[in-house]
């Protein structure tokens, strides 16, 4: 999916309204300092693409992450404010069905809200103004 | 292959108008970002304009802004910038060029054109 | 807007020596700076994007570097070829600026 016809201000306003608050309720109890932050993003279409990626995209040791709060309200910020975004990720959510796991929070889920919790912080630092 | 033509440039009055086009082949056009460059003679390269793939975010250098408009029609595999008011200074070789369009590639320019020249003259 | 400042203007340097160009960014804009080549009537070429990594076809002597506001570009060992001006751009918000340029010159 091409991000960069996303309102990027309007899923800065959802990040900062909900999801960022999501996020911090998943880390609870956890230092910020714990995990070092290894993945990195250029703008904001990139920043959305690795934060796609990382939210809904299982990998080894967290294959849970897609049915969390910040998730779910994650896709639906990317389905409201990025034109053509559902239509891309029917198949991929048909997909992630038959693989779903049982929700286990683990430590490698942590390090992965972790690196999350920095993409998008570094996604609400460019002044991007629309014309 | 990709090639990206440009044309619609010439000389042109102060305070004049002149529409550039760039006529994209070898790619799903649809699918790319699209970005205006321009170099005035013997200068370095200047950013104008980009549009994003489906025409939903559109961005101007500062210099321009308010004089330029940058469309796109994904039908034809054309890309455009209609440029009113046109100063001494806006003399330059414009080039389109194609946006990377995935992750670590957006905002960077892939693919130019020759470019066409505009000269801004009375 | 974010202003980019490359340095040196020109660079003398012979075959086989190793070019250092440098760009300096106004605010952090790391890791998105790409690298541009042009040469005499031709139209500027991708190099180097997001810091660091070569773009397609780049020959392996060209590699890019940097983080938070510096960033450089090295040319291992010069060919003839690569006697140009070289630009960096930043493609981290928009208006997405170009430095002024390196011109690469032969000693």
């Known amino acids: 999916y091409d991000f960069t016809n996303c309102d990027f201000e309007k899923i800065k306003a959802a990040y900062l309204s909900t999801i960022s608050k999501d996020l911090i309720t998943y880390m609870s109890g956890t230092k910020s300092t714990e995990f070092n932050n290894t993945v990195s993003c250029s703008n904001r279409p990139h920043c959305l693409t690795e934060i796609q990626s990382l939210t809904f995209n299982p990998t080894a040791g967290c294959a849970s992450l897609a049915k969390e709060m910040f998730a779910m309200k994650t896709k639906a910020a990317l389905a409201i404010w990025c034109p053509g975004y559902s239509e891309t990720q029917i198949n991929a959510t048909q997909a992630m069905k038959k693989r779903r796991k049982r929700k286990v929070t683990t430590n490698k889920c942590l390090e992965q809200v972790s690196q999350l919790q920095g993409l998008w912080r570094r996604f609400n630092r460019p002044l991007l103004k629309q014309q | 292959e990709v090639q990206l033509v440009e044309s619609g440039g010439g000389l042109v009055q102060p305070g004049g108008s002149l529409r550039l086009s760039c006529a994209a082949s070898g790619f799903t056009f649809s699918s790319f970002g699209m970005h205006w460059v321009r170099q005035a003679p013997g200068k370095g390269l200047e950013w104008v304009s980009y549009?994003?793939?489906?025409?939903?975010?559109?961005y101007y250098a500062d210099t321009v802004k308010g004089r330029f408009t940058i469309s796109r029609d994904n039908a034809k595999n054309s890309l455009y910038l209609q440029m009113n008011s046109l100063r001494a200074e806006d003399t330059a070789v414009y080039y389109c060029?194609?946006?990377?369009?995935?992750?670590?590639?957006?905002?960077?320019?892939?693919?130019w054109g020759q470019g066409t020249l505009v000269t801004v003259s009375s | 807007e974010i202003v980019l400042t490359q340095s040196p203007a020109t660079l003398s340097l012979s075959p086989g020596e190793r070019a250092t160009l440098s760009c300096k960014a106004s605010?952090?804009?790391?890791?998105?700076v790409a690298w541009y080549q042009q040469k005499p009537g031709q139209s500027p070429r991708l190099l180097i994007y997001s810091a660091s990594y070569r773009y397609t076809g780049v020959p392996a002597r060209f590699s890019g570097s940097g983080s938070g506001t510096d960033f450089t570009l090295t040319i291992s060992s010069l060919e003839p070829e690569d006697f140009a001006v070289y630009y960096c751009q930043q493609h981290y918000s928009s208006p997405f600026t170009f430095g002024q340029g390196t011109k690469l010159e032969i000693k």
């Open positions: 605010q952090d804009v790391s890791p998105a």
């Open positions: 060029a194609r946006d990377g369009g995935s992750r670590r590639h957006y905002y960077v320019m892939d693919y």
């Open positions: 549009i994003s793939s489906g025409s939903s975010n559109i």
